[in-house]
């Protein structure tokens, strides 16, 4: 299953299978997840140790037990691959990282006025993977403000140094956020030059485009067919670059297909697994396993539940079959793409879903009436659970927020449907930022259920908590994915990083905003809150938030929208915005339901019709 | 020039066998993996069975499992289809259609169709 | 099995119009999307190959998108020879099921 926790003070000891430098312990984990071997990473931050060469350190390990033995080392930091994590897999790491220079190949030098400008510039930038801003105080007068744009052969830094007054960070080109667009057509019967990146084995060319796509140096492939003339090279996926991010020349080739990365594509990337199934054809590989089931779907769940499993081979031979079982193969190679395709076999073939990000239709949890007053305009991708609950009916009007946990679930405050209990009324907007974009084109979802908690009164703050099942599950994507759910009565979390998102009023007697805001609020004590609030009763079920001299808060508008806190580098939902006195007034904190204390009712509401628990563990 | 051509459709009594013939010229037949598709007359397409490259690996839509069988012969270059125990809702155009290479399998070269009645 | 859902189910055009068709699958199917045409008495033709792929000798004005589940044909100016019914089809896994079909008619 999925494992999210994260081990401070501890270094896996042996199984390495690659190691690079990275920023932080959140890259290594990322770099660790899309990786085809690693289940385990550690991390050495440039605190933990004083050998230059292993500062920032990420050490990516193999183990047949999916465990290894952990030593003592202060400060390093040690987790598991996010395979198997659902939609908490992804490519997209937005962090800056202030007094670090990431080093590369420096391909292209310009003066920016702040590190987000040198950021977008990476972003917009075919090869750019990573960037170093030199700030307006850095000690050299003539390198302040330069934006230096970065490659390596591995994606990742060749070295990283603690300098003062550099903040650098990683290409948003896959959180879909580039402004290049891509290239979707594939063209038949046509070959492109120039220098192969790496070479891999695939079945078909939509699996040669993924495997580019998430690769670090790949812009565009080759693929040669089962018919290709050459024996050997029948299968091949060349994945390529050149110097000037586009094929030099392409020749007109029969049995071959061409195509380009859809890294630089905006607000939609390929999933980074193959989901396919191909009938008749024998995927060969190292073997992990060799189980007897019924039926090819079967076996390619078993693929992904067993985490070193790559690919799989279902067997119809009469000789691999007893009763209505036969033998699924369970293999593995380096690369994690077969080392051998045979056509014309009875077998099915097809890879393991450890990395897709769709999940199954679940709500996300992990183990371990109000606009934003004081905030700033959000970016594309930032808060991918926030949904717009709109109601329609001569005119439509945004009324309240709410999070996305699930493929079909939005949790929200029970006062939004105040008045207004009818389904049909409403539309669900996910995966957008400005409300301006909404026209009559834009697809919404539609409401099959309101649960409103059984205890929630109108006019009373208690139990402010419903639960929406959308007619039709939501496909996830780097704008549009759930939120996950703190554990059940959670109190021993201390969270020091929130926000709260929404469109809602920015002053008490304001207007609905068009541009997502957000705005980081500290928690509040329920004792403090208490205080604050003497006419009403704070309950345990409640959490407050806000600055003891106000000025930023939730308003109208942002009810029912997330409070969610980051602790070891994942969001969880902490508040749903419920109520508190005007907005961003003085000693006035805003108060959330608490989630946590609702666990329960969430899970027993969110169950299928046929009992099983719609709940998606990632610990 | 790429071409499939089906032959083999007619008239027959519910219960009755026909066997469909699928001669394709033109592009390398052993290497490709074939299907059946059909079209009931005003109808949409059905997908009716496919068949891997060598012959070795067959599937079938339920609504013909255990009637129809799907075979080939690559020395022929020629893709069949054996019906039996024909009923009234397998009137229809029967095609004959080769998948793509690489491409996902989509069908991609497909024969004019015959005929197929099945009636009393 | 996985259903696949066109839509509208017919619609009225004339020559030089962007014509847009849906198709929706009852699960995600990834990119193995396809779009065939086809014209009365004849077979279909293949038009779009993995939702956005286009077939070899087919015009550019046809074009495909989208993914998992939802799905867009769009003939950007539509011409005298592409009145015909539009088939959506998946390759995702058997049973490889069409929608029921889109007849595209002159108004």
């Known amino acids: 299953g999925c494992l999210t926790q994260l081990y401070e003070n501890a270094f896996f000891r042996g199984g390495d299978v690659a190691s690079m430098y990275t920023p932080n312990a959140q890259y290594c984990q990322m770099r660790c997840t899309f990786h085809p071997r690693c289940l385990l990473f550690s991390f050495l931050p440039a605190s933990s140790i004083n050998d230059m060469e292993k500062r920032f350190g990420c050490f990516l390990k193999d183990s047949v037990t999916g465990t290894l033995p952990k030593v003592h080392r202060t400060g390093a930091v040690s987790g598991h691959s996010l395979k198997q994590c659902g939609h908490q897999i992804s490519a997209c790491h937005r962090d800056i990282y202030k007094g670090v220079d990431m080093r590369g190949v420096n391909f292209n030098v310009s003066k920016v006025s702040s590190v987000e400008e040198c950021q977008k510039r990476c972003t917009s930038n075919i090869r750019c993977q990573f960037f170093s801003y030199a700030t307006q105080t850095f000690h050299k007068a003539e390198y302040r403000n330069n934006c230096l744009l970065k490659y390596s052969p591995g994606g990742t830094p060749t070295a990283i140094k603690v300098l003062s007054n550099v903040e650098s960070g990683f290409s948003l080109k896959p959180c879909a956020l580039s402004e290049i667009g891509c290239h979707m057509n594939i063209f038949q019967h046509l070959a492109f030059s120039d220098v192969d990146v790496a070479r891999v084995l695939t079945p078909d060319a939509f699996v040669c485009r993924t495997i580019c796509t998430y690769h670090p140096n790949c812009l565009f492939f080759t693929f040669y067919t089962n018919v290709w003339k050459i024996e050997s090279q029948r299968n091949v996926c060349l994945l390529k670059t050149s110097e000037s991010g586009t094929p030099s020349s392409s020749t007109p080739q029969e049995n071959t297909i061409s195509g380009y990365s859809l890294l630089t594509c905006k607000r939609t990337l390929p999933e980074p697994c193959h989901s396919k199934i191909y009938p008749g054809v024998d995927f060969g590989g190292e073997e992990l396993n060799v189980t007897f089931v019924k039926g090819v779907n079967v076996c390619q769940e078993t693929c992904t539940k067993m985490i070193r499993c790559q690919f799989f081979t279902y067997s119809l031979l009469p000789e691999d079959c007893k009763e209505e079982k036969c033998k699924c193969f369970l293999r593995l190679s380096m690369d994690g793409s077969p080392t051998r395709i045979a056509y014309g076999t009875q077998g099915s073939s097809g890879y393991s879903l450890r990395l897709c990000n769709t999940g199954d239709n679940s709500v996300c949890t992990t183990k371990t009436s109000t606009r934003i007053v004081g905030g700033t305009n959000s970016s594309w991708g930032e808060w991918p659970w926030q949904v717009s609950l709109q109601v329609k009916l001569t005119a439509q009007r945004h009324l309240c927020g709410g999070s996305l946990i699930g493929h079909q679930w939005v949790l929200t405050a029970a006062h939004c449907f105040d008045g207004l209990p009818l389904q049909d009324v409403w539309r669900i907007y996910s995966g957008i930022l400005n409300l301006s974009d909404i026209t009559k084109d834009t697809p919404f979802s539609q409401i099959k259920e309101i649960i409103i908690h059984q205890n929630y009164k109108v006019s009373e703050g208690n139990h402010d908590i419903a639960l929406i099942k959308l007619q039709a599950p939501l496909n996830y994507t780097e704008f549009q994915k759930p939120i996950c759910l703190p554990s059940k009565g959670d109190t021993s979390t201390i969270y020091t990083n929130c926000w709260v998102t929404g469109w809602g009023f920015s002053k008490e007697k304001g207007e609905i905003q068009n541009i997502l805001q957000k705005v980081n609020i500290p928690l509040v004590t329920n004792e403090e809150c208490q205080k604050r609030y003497q006419d009403y009763k704070i309950t345990q079920r409640m959490v407050c938030a806000g600055y003891k001299e106000g000025g930023k808060d939730a308003c109208k508008g942002d009810s029912g929208g997330p409070l969610v806190c980051k602790h070891n580098g994942m969001w969880r939902l902490v508040g749903i915005t419920s109520w508190g006195e005007g907005c961003a007034r003085r000693e006035q904190p805003g108060v959330y339901t608490k989630v946590a204390e609702y666990m329960d009712w969430i899970l027993e509401k969110t169950q299928s019709s046929d009992g099983k628990a719609q709940m998606q563990s990632p610990a | 020039e790429v071409q499939l051509l089906e032959s083999g459709g007619g008239l027959v009594q519910p219960g009755g066998s026909l066997r469909l013939s699928c001669a394709a010229s033109g592009f390398t037949f052993s290497s490709y993996a074939m299907v059946w598709v059909r079209q009931a007359p005003g109808k949409g397409l059905e997908w009716v069975s496919s068949i891997g490259s060598s012959g070795g690996f067959t599937l079938y839509a339920d609504s013909v499992k255990g009637r129809f069988t799907i075979s080939r012969d690559n020395s022929k270059n020629t893709l069949y289809l054996q019906m039996n125990s024909l009923r009234a809702e397998d009137t229809a155009v029967y095609y004959c259609?080769?998948?793509?290479?690489?491409?996902?399998?989509?069908?991609?070269?497909w024969g004019q169709g015959t005929m197929v009645t099945v009636s009393s | 099995d996985i259903q696949m859902t066109q839509s509208p189910s017919s619609l009225s055009a004339s020559v030089g119009d962007r014509v847009t068709i849906t198709c929706r699958a009852s699960?995600?199917?990834?990119?193995?999307l396809n779009w065939y045409h086809q014209k009365p008495g004849k077979a279909p033709n293949l038009l779009i190959y993995?939702?956005?792929s286009l077939q070899s000798g087919v015009p550019s004005r046809f074009s495909g998108s989208g993914s998992g589940t939802d799905f867009t044909l769009t003939i950007s100016s539509l011409q005298p020879g592409d009145f015909a019914t539009y088939y959506c089809q998946h390759s995702y896994s058997t049973p490889f099921t069409f929608g029921g079909g889109t007849k595209v008619e002159i108004k």
């Open positions: 259609a080769s998948m793509n290479l690489g491409g996902g399998d989509a069908f991609d070269i």
């Open positions: 699960q995600s199917i990834g990119i193995y």
């Open positions: 993995g939702a956005s």
